[in-house]
Interface confidence: low
């Protein structure tokens, strides 16, 4: 009987600390089960915030192409909105460019045509008394956009129109043949005709961008 | 004897069910400390999404700025005016004036002075090599800004500021004393100092309007 | 030090041309304008023009325009000056100098025109 | 194109005097004027440049003046071996001309 109210004992005891350690599981369990859930919420929260930083990061990428777009577009709008490009002269409606190189005259002509341009071409007395004052301090000759096969033929410009009889007086050789024809130029502010095969300087001249200045 | 059995039996199981759940907890408290660690790992990396993302809002918000910018200043420069007046020559940052009169060097000075200008001030190789381009067709002398009141006292620009030693070397007069002073000009690519008091063409110099008008 | 060395004297018949060359030395050929003056026999002396060897720019005095080309060839250090269409009234001696002003000369070439 | 005066065309002076030289150019050439000495048979020799500036190399002697129009060249003392022709140039505008020369002998 002593034996048999230890052994009870024992066991009430043991019942009570086994009804304490299922409680202790229960409670863990729940907590397990916040946890769990606290963690799938902080999952999902890092889920929205990958997502977001994504989303900002594709839109940065998209504001940052428009801004290069933009400034590339203000680059050639700046010099859209120059009427004429570098190192040119802007007068009235037309840009000039002084060559710094010595050619024959077709070459010269080339050259500008690689810069959207033409040799000079001189429309009115202003234009003539603008080019004589620009050229007023070099004695150096220029080709000018004039020329013609021989002298049975008339003086024409590059865009195939007459000159103007008025304008200036040929001098030189106006009278002589060349195999590759007569070319004008101007030197110290008279024009003269010359064999098109010598080299001179030259003046390229296209239209100044005046639109929305 | 036999409820001493039962009892022992009772017991043994207990025992058993005891020691389960101990190991039982024992398991979940280890879960429970790896949820944690999870957890503070999961918090952390919100912390830094959240931290990125925020960075991403500022860079996107100056980037949306710098894009407003832009596009005002796109809309400003589609109007705006051209680079350099009529008549100079636009080169990286400024507008030239070749003079087409020829004064002595205060005059000159007071013609550029009248057109919004200075006269021609030489910063680096790349403004020589310019100009000395430009000039290659003239044979003429052409006064640039850099005077010296006698020999003893330094070269220096209309700015106040000292020639660069190492841009160019000043020929010819350099050791006279005139009470006009000494300038110099530049003429076939070299540069030489005179009499201020002589005639020569000049060459005006003032900064390209490049800003966003 | 700076030389400048001419070809040697010619004889030429009237309605001939003659092509005079001038070697240049210890200075950058390209900086300098190589100009052309000549003197006629116990005459003074005349300009006839000039050319910029940087870029092979030419300027002639109109008495000569038609008649005088001035190249030169960089490769070479050489300028030349022909004169075509020879009249004996072109006999002189023909100098080429370094211009700015004119510091260095060649020696001369005398072109003797006679039929 | 500038015409180029020089006077007198021959001077005949004694060793130790000063000689003077004058040029007038037909319009105002800026002091763009350099004046040469040339020796029978050899090429001219550079005095002056800028109207007054002193060649390297060049005597003291040699001296040069004037404005607009009018130049002078001037030799203060003057030695044997001045015994040449001198000649005044314009630079200001090509075609560079040259004046006529003048001969200068010892009495």
């Known amino acids: 009987s002593q034996v048999s109210n230890l052994l009870k004992q024992q066991q009430t005891n043991l019942t009570h600390q086994k009804n304490k350690l299922e409680g202790q599981i229960s409670a863990r369990q729940q907590a397990e089960e916040a946890s769990q859930e606290s963690q799938n919420e902080l999952k999902e929260m890092i889920e929205t915030l990958a997502w977001k930083l994504n989303e900002k990061s594709k839109e940065q990428m998209e504001l940052h192409h428009q801004n290069l777009n933009l400034q590339e577009t203000l680059k050639r709008v700046a010099n859209c909105s120059a009427p004429c490009p570098q190192d040119w002269i802007w007068h009235e409606e037309n840009c000039y460019l002084f060559s710094t190189g010595s050619f024959n005259w077709e070459k010269s002509q080339e050259k500008c045509l690689s810069l959207d341009a033409k040799l000079l071409k001189i429309n009115s007395t202003a234009d003539l008394d603008f080019i004589q004052q620009a050229i007023s301090y070099s004695s150096f000759p220029f080709w000018m956009g004039l020329s013609r096969r021989n002298p049975s033929y008339p003086w024409l410009w590059e865009d195939g129109s007459p000159l103007m009889p008025h304008l200036f007086r040929i001098r030189g050789a106006v009278s002589q043949t060349y195999p590759s024809g007569t070319c004008a130029y101007i030197q110290r502010g008279a024009v003269y005709a010359e064999n098109c095969i010598l080299a001179a300087f030259s003046i390229c001249q296209k239209k100044a961008n005046l639109r929305a200045q | 004897s036999q409820v001493s059995n039962l009892l022992k039996q009772q017991q043994t199981n207990l025992t058993h069910q005891k020691n389960k759940l101990e190991g039982q907890i024992s398991a979940r408290q280890q879960a429970e400390e790896a949820s944690q660690e999870s957890q503070n790992e999961l918090k952390e990396m919100i912390e830094t999404l959240a931290w990125k993302l925020n960075e991403k809002s500022k860079e996107q918000m100056e980037l949306h700025h710098q894009n407003l910018n832009l596009q005002e200043t796109l809309k400003r420069v589609a109007n705006c005016s051209a680079p350099c007046p009529q008549d100079w020559i636009w080169h990286e940052e400024n507008c030239y004036l070749f003079s087409t009169g020829s004064f002595n060097w205060e005059k000159s000075q007071e013609k550029c002075l009248s057109l919004d200008a200075k006269l021609l001030k030489i910063n680096s190789t790349a403004d020589l090599d310019f100009i000395q381009q430009a000039i290659s067709y003239s044979s003429f002398p052409f006064w640039m800004g850099l005077s010296r009141r006698n020999p003893s006292y330094p070269w220096l620009w209309e700015d106040g500021s000292p020639l660069m030693p190492h841009l160019f070397r000043i020929r010819g007069a350099v050791s006279q004393t005139y009470p006009s002073g000494t300038c110099a000009y530049i003429q076939r690519g070299a540069v030489y100092a005179e009499n201020c008091i002589l005639a020569a063409f000049s060459i005006c110099q003032k900064k390209a309007n490049l800003r966003a008008q | 030090q700076v030389q400048l060395v001419q070809s040697g004297a010619e004889v030429k018949k009237p309605g001939a041309s003659v092509k005079v060359s001038c070697k240049a030395s210890?200075?950058?050929?390209?900086?300098?304008?190589v100009h052309w003056v000549r003197q006629a026999p116990g005459q003074g002396l005349e300009w006839m023009g000039a050319i910029h060897p940087g870029s092979g720019g030419a300027a002639y005095v109109q008495k000569f325009q038609g008649r005088v080309t001035m190249t030169r060839d960089t490769s070479i250090s050489t300028a030349y000056m022909e004169l075509s269409r020879l009249r004996s009234d072109d006999t002189a001696v023909y100098y080429c100098a370094r211009w700015l002003p004119i510091d260095y000369w060649g020696q001369g070439t005398l072109v003797t025109v006679s039929s | 194109d500038i015409q180029m005066t020089q006077s007198p065309s021959s001077v005949s002076a004694s060793v130790g005097d000063r000689v003077t030289i004058t040029c007038r150019a037909s319009q105002g050439i800026n002091n763009w004027l350099v004046w040469y000495q040339q020796k029978p048979g050899k090429a001219p020799k550079l005095l002056l440049y800028a109207a007054s500036r002193l060649e390297s190399g060049v005597p003291s002697r040699f001296s040069g003046s004037g404005s607009g129009t009018d130049y002078t060249l001037t030799i203060s003392s003057l030695q044997p071996e001045d015994i040449a022709t001198y000649y005044c140039q314009q630079y200001l505008i090509t075609p560079y001309t040259f004046g006529q020369g003048t001969k200068l002998e010892i009495k």
């Open positions: 210890g200075y950058t050929f390209t900086d300098y304008e």
